[in-house]
């Protein structure tokens, strides 16, 4: 807290300019009018203030706006944003995408800080949903943003926003998140033709149910092994040998290298060995001919 001292004669700031960098902290406090600072916030960023000086400027704004800064000030905070606490940000009402972009730019190249997370949360809650433009902006700055949301939060993403999602944005999503995103993607891309549809839906297939995988197997999609390995195990188990062969196309040979890993391993364990043999890949671990799984209660639980 800076002591209240009178401004020395002739030092009263008429505008926010470079001369202020020579002011001591108490002089900034005494000689810079908070209202002037608020109207000329856009200049602060261009002036190489020290962290201590920025603390004083923040303090002045806090005094002027105890209920939270107006958006006209927030949009021009620049590096002063880094001085804000999540508690400060929770008082804000940010509605403009331009404001959001300006503040994300300040933090660019760094991990998502608690301040940024709070800002985004306030912004999205204010909008009521994660619209396409917002998602575009957020994933541009933070490719992992989508996967940082809970399934509940993801449920507010409208299908139209899915067009903004790039494959790399889903890299760190877990199956529960993809379970929420997949039906939205399916809806978003439903009017595309076969091959185009598969290109778009591929990244989301970790949330696809069996019925959709069976349908895809009839469309000559040639799914790569990396995508196949990310499918839900419970969705893969009901696929027949023929369907897996059709789904993977020329990539079916890759099953051999993955036969000890899920979901391939679990799928193999449920196939008849002589069915697996028709693939000619040397896959081992299927159910020997003549054997039958009789414990139906157990397999019901598994399926």
């Amino acid at each position: 807290e800076v002591e209240k001292t009178a401004c020395p004669s002739g030092k009263k700031a008429r505008e926010i300019d470079e001369s202020l960098i020579f002011y001591k902290k108490w002089e900034l406090e005494a000689c810079v009018d908070a209202a002037l600072l608020a109207t000329q916030m856009d200049r602060v960023n261009a002036i190489p203030f020290t962290y201590e000086q920025l603390d004083v400027l923040k303090h002045k704004l806090d005094e002027l706006y105890p209920q939270g800064y107006p958006e006209s000030v927030i949009q021009h905070l620049g590096y002063l944003f880094l001085k804000m606490s999540p508690e400060d940000i929770r008082k804000w009402n940010v509605t403009s995408l331009e404001t959001l972009k300006a503040l994300l730019e300040v933090n660019k190249g760094h991990e998502m800080s608690p301040q940024v997370a709070t800002l985004i949360d306030r912004f999205v809650k204010g909008r009521g949903q994660l619209d396409k433009d917002t998602l575009d902006t957020l994933t541009a700055f933070y490719p992992g943003y989508l996967c940082s949301l809970s399934p509940e939060e993801l449920s507010s993403v409208p299908p139209s926003s899915i067009w903004a999602v790039r494959p790399q944005d889903l890299d760190t999503c877990d199956p529960r998140q993809l379970d929420v995103l997949y039906p939205k993607a399916r809806l978003a891309f439903q009017n595309m033709n076969g091959s185009e549809y598969f290109v778009k839906i591929q990244s989301f297939l970790g949330g696809a149910p069996t019925e959709d995988l069976k349908a895809l197997s009839q469309q000559n999609v040639s799914m790569d092994l990396a995508t196949f390995m990310k499918l839900r195990t419970d969705a893969v188990l009901p696929l027949t040998v023929a369907e897996v062969q059709k789904l993977l196309g020329p990539h079916v040979e890759g099953l051999k290298a993955e036969e000890r890993h899920r979901p391939v391993r679990d799928w193999i364990l449920r196939q008849r060995q002589d069915d697996l043999d028709t693939l000619g890949l040397g896959l081992q671990g299927g159910i020997p001919n003549g054997y039958l799984v009789l414990d139906l209660s157990m397999q019901e639980a598994l399926s």
Partner: nanobody
Framework: QVQLVESGGGLVQTGGSLRLSCAAS????????MEWFRQAPGKQREWVAS???????YYRDSVKGRFTISRDNAKSTVYLQMNSLKPEDTAIYYC?????????WGQGTQVTVSS
């Protein structure tokens, strides 16, 4: 030659039940996985349920708890018991036999659920 013949379809009211049968001939039934598919007017054919030759059963999400697939290897027949039927279950129901890369289809039986 392989033949699959479905029966048991018909008109039923919402909430009603039907039991479909699919009798197979010309194949060693026990080593084939058996599945039910359906196709509604103007839509693509979609998978409903499977009963593998090794005893596993699977269902599409929308029919779980309402439909039950079973098989009788001695009679070379697979069944689909459909309860709590809904208008959206209206479709032609097909059975399919699969083994390795071989697949055989039946001609289908119409199921209509009226509201």
């Amino acid at each position: 030659q392989v033949q699959l013949v479905e029966s048991g379809g018909g008109l039923v009211q919402t909430g009603g039940s039907l039991r479909l049968s699919c009798a197979a001939s010309g194949l060693t039934f026990g080593v084939y996985g058996m599945e039910w598919f359906r196709q509604a007017p103007g839509k693509q054919r979609e998978w409903v349920a499977s009963h593998t030759s090794t005893g596993y059963v699977y269902y599409r999400d929308s029919v779980k708890g309402r439909f039950t697939i079973s098989r009788d290897n001695a009679k070379s027949t697979v069944y689909l018991q459909m309860n709590s039927l809904k208008p959206e279950d209206t479709a032609i129901y097909y059975c399919k036999a699969n083994r390795g890369s071989y697949e055989y289809w039946g001609q289908g039986t119409q199921v209509t659920v009226s509201s």
